[in-house]
C-alpha cells in the first residue's frame, strides 16, 4: 500500500500512524496550495486540527479581512488557522467542531457542534452550526442562525455599530452577539468587565475575558 | 425594523400610580438590556432605570428608588415601568430605550421608543 | 454623581459653516477596557434622541459623516463638519463610564 503523502486535515493525518501532537503541513482541498497547522492528537481520541488557539495575548488579533483569510500567527502558540482553508475543508465533509476554554480560576468547560462548516468568501465564510453539546453553557454563544465573519476593515455585523472595531478581533459577530474568542487578550485580575475581551456568554457572562481558547475541528466521522 | 412602541401615559394625581408599558418588535428583545429615560417639559434627559436582559439585574436612579419599579416580559417582548406615589416632579415624557450592544454590554441607547408624557397634577 | 457640562448651550450656525460642541466630566471617563463610555445624541424638534456617536469616537451607522467625536478623559468634543438645516435640534452629551448614566443640559443648535 502506497504511504500518503498529502493531508487535507489532522484526522487523515493521524489515521496514517502519525499520532504525536505538533505542526503539520496540510493540503488545500483539491489543491497543492499547503498551510501549516497545529494537529491535536490527545484530545478526545486526536485526530483534531485546531484553527484557533489564545493563550497568552502575545499576538494581535485585531487583524484585517485578508489576514483572516489566509490566517496568521504561529502554530506552536496564538494563531487564526485561515477562513478559506476552513471553508474549503468542511465544504467537503462534515466536521463537528469542539472549543475549549480555560478561565482565570482553573476551571475548564467546552462546547462541540455536531456539524459545522463556513460559506465562502462570497458569503463572507458565514458560519453554520448545528447540535450542541457540552460544559460551556446549554445555548451556543455562537448566534444562531449563524452570522458573517466581520473584521475591522470589514462590517458584515447587524448592528449600527461596527462590533469588529469596538469589540476588537474578526468574528462572526451579530449585534454584536454573546461570544468573542478573537476579542482583546487581558491577563489575570484584568479580565473582568471588559465588554471588548475574550467572551464567551453562556459560560462566563459579558464582561468576563477567558486565559485561553482553543477551537478545533475533525471529520464527524472520526 | 427595530421598533419601541410606548403607551400608558396620561394625567394622575399626586400620590397615585401609573404603569407604562413598552412593546418591542424587529429585534431579539431576550438579548438587549433596556431602559427608561425622562424629559420633564423644556428641560433635559434623565436616566430613570435599567433593567438587564434576563431582568437579573436591576438599577433605580435615587430620585424614583422605592416608588418606580421595572420589569420585563420576553415572552411577550415587552417592557414595563410602574410608577407609585407620583410626584408633580415626576411629570415628565418618558422614553423607553435600548442598548446600542446586546447581552448587556451598556454602550449607550441604540434605539428610542416614541416617548409617553406621563402628566402628575391634582 | 457625575456631572456634564455642555457649551455652548445655544449655538446659532450659518449652513455650511462648521460647528463645535464641548462635553466636560467631572470625572474622567476612560474606562480600564481603553475606551471612554461617552456618546453624543441629537434630538430634532418633536423627536425622541436618537444616537451620533458611541464610545467617544464611533459613529453609528447612518449618521453622516460630517459628524464626528473625540476627546478623552474629561474633555470631548463634537463636531460638525459642515452644518445643514436638518442638523438642528438639541444635542446631549451622556456617559456611561460610572453609574448612574448621566447627561449634559444640551446644546441648542439653531440656524441663523
Known amino acids: 500500500k502506497e504511504e500518503q503523502t498529502t493531508f487535507r486535515d489532522c484526522a487523515e493525518i493521524f489515521k496514517s500512524g502519525l499520532t504525536t501532537s505538533g505542526i503539520y503541513t496540510l493540503t488545500f482541498p483539491n489543491s497543492t496550495e499547503e498551510i501549516k497547522a497545529y494537529c491535536d492528537m490527545d484530545v478526545g481520541g486526536g485526530g483534531w486540527t485546531v484553527i484557533q488557539h489564545r493563550e497568552d495575548g502575545s499576538v494581535d488579533f485585531q487583524r484585517t479581512w485578508k489576514e483572516y483569510k489566509e490566517g496568521f500567527g504561529s502554530p506552536l502558540g496564538e494563531y487564526w488557522l485561515g477562513n478559506e482553508f476552513v471553508s474549503q475543508l468542511t465544504g467537503q465533509h462534515r466536521y463537528v467542531l469542539k472549543i475549549q476554554l480555560k478561565d482565570w480560576e482553573g476551571n475548564e468547560a467546552h462546547s462541540l457542534y455536531d456539524h459545522f462548516y463556513l460559506a465562502g468568501e462570497e458569503s463572507n465564510y458565514r458560519i453554520h452550526l448545528t447540535g450542541l453539546t457540552g460544559t460551556a453553557g446549554k445555548i451556543s454563544s455562537i448566534s444562531q442562525p449563524g452570522s458573517d465573519f466581520s473584521t475591522k476593515d470589514s462590517d458584515n455585523d447587524k448592528c449600527i455599530c461596527k462590533c469588529s472595531q469596538m469589540l476588537s478581533g474578526g468574528w462572526w459577530f451579530d449585534a454584536c452577539g454573546p461570544s468573542n474568542l478573537n476579542g482583546q487578550y487581558y491577563p489575570q485580575k484584568q479580565n473582568t468587565n471588559k465588554f471588548n475581551g475574550i467572551k464567551w456568554y453562556y459560560w462566563k457572562g459579558s464582561g468576563y475575558s477567558l486565559k485561553a481558547t482553543t477551537m478545533m475541528i475533525r471529520p464527524a466521522d472520526f | 425594523e427595530v421598533q419601541l412602541v410606548q403607551s400608558g401615559g396620561g394625567v394622575v394625581q399626586p400620590g397615585r400610580s401609573l404603569r407604562l408599558s413598552c412593546a418591542a418588535s424587529?429585534?431579539?428583545?431576550?438579548?438587549?438590556?433596556m431602559h427608561w429615560v425622562r424629559q420633564a417639559p423644556g428641560k433635559g434627559l434623565e436616566w430613570v432605570s435599567y433593567i438587564s436582559s434576563s431582568g437579573s439585574t436591576i438599577y433605580y436612579a435615587d430620585s424614583v428608588k422605592g416608588r418606580f419599579t421595572i420589569s420585563r416580559d420576553n415572552a411577550k417582548n415587552s417592557l414595563y415601568l410602574q410608577m407609585n406615589s407620583l410626584r408633580a416632579e415626576d411629570t415628565a415624557v418618558y422614553y423607553c430605550?435600548?442598548?446600542?450592544?446586546?447581552?448587556?454590554?451598556?454602550?449607550?441607547?441604540?434605539?428610542w421608543g416614541q416617548g409617553t408624557l406621563v402628566t402628575v397634577s391634582s | 454623581d457625575i456631572v456634564m457640562t455642555q457649551s455652548p448651550l445655544s449655538l446659532p450656525v450659518t449652513p455650511g459653516e462648521p460647528a463645535s460642541i464641548s462635553c466636560r466630566s467631572s470625572q474622567s471617563l476612560l474606562h480600564s477596557n481603553g475606551y471612554n463610555y461617552l456618546d453624543w445624541y441629537l434630538q430634532k424638534p418633536g423627536q425622541s434622541p436618537q444616537l451620533l456617536i458611541y464610545l467617544g469616537s464611533n459613529r453609528a451607522s447612518g449618521v453622516p459623516d460630517r459628524f464626528s467625536g473625540s476627546g478623552s478623559g474629561t474633555d470631548f468634543t463634537l463636531k460638525i463638519s459642515r452644518v445643514e438645516a436638518e442638523d438642528v435640534g438639541v444635542y446631549y452629551c451622556?456617559?456611561?463610564?460610572?453609574?448612574?448614566?448621566?447627561f449634559g443640559q444640551g446644546t441648542k443648535l439653531e440656524i441663523k
Open positions: 451622556m456617559q456611561g463610564t460610572h453609574w448612574p448614566p448621566t
Open positions: 430605550a435600548r442598548d446600542l450592544l446586546d447581552y448587556d454590554i451598556l454602550t449607550g441607547y441604540g434605539y
Open positions: 424587529g429585534f431579539t428583545f431576550s438579548s438587549y438590556g
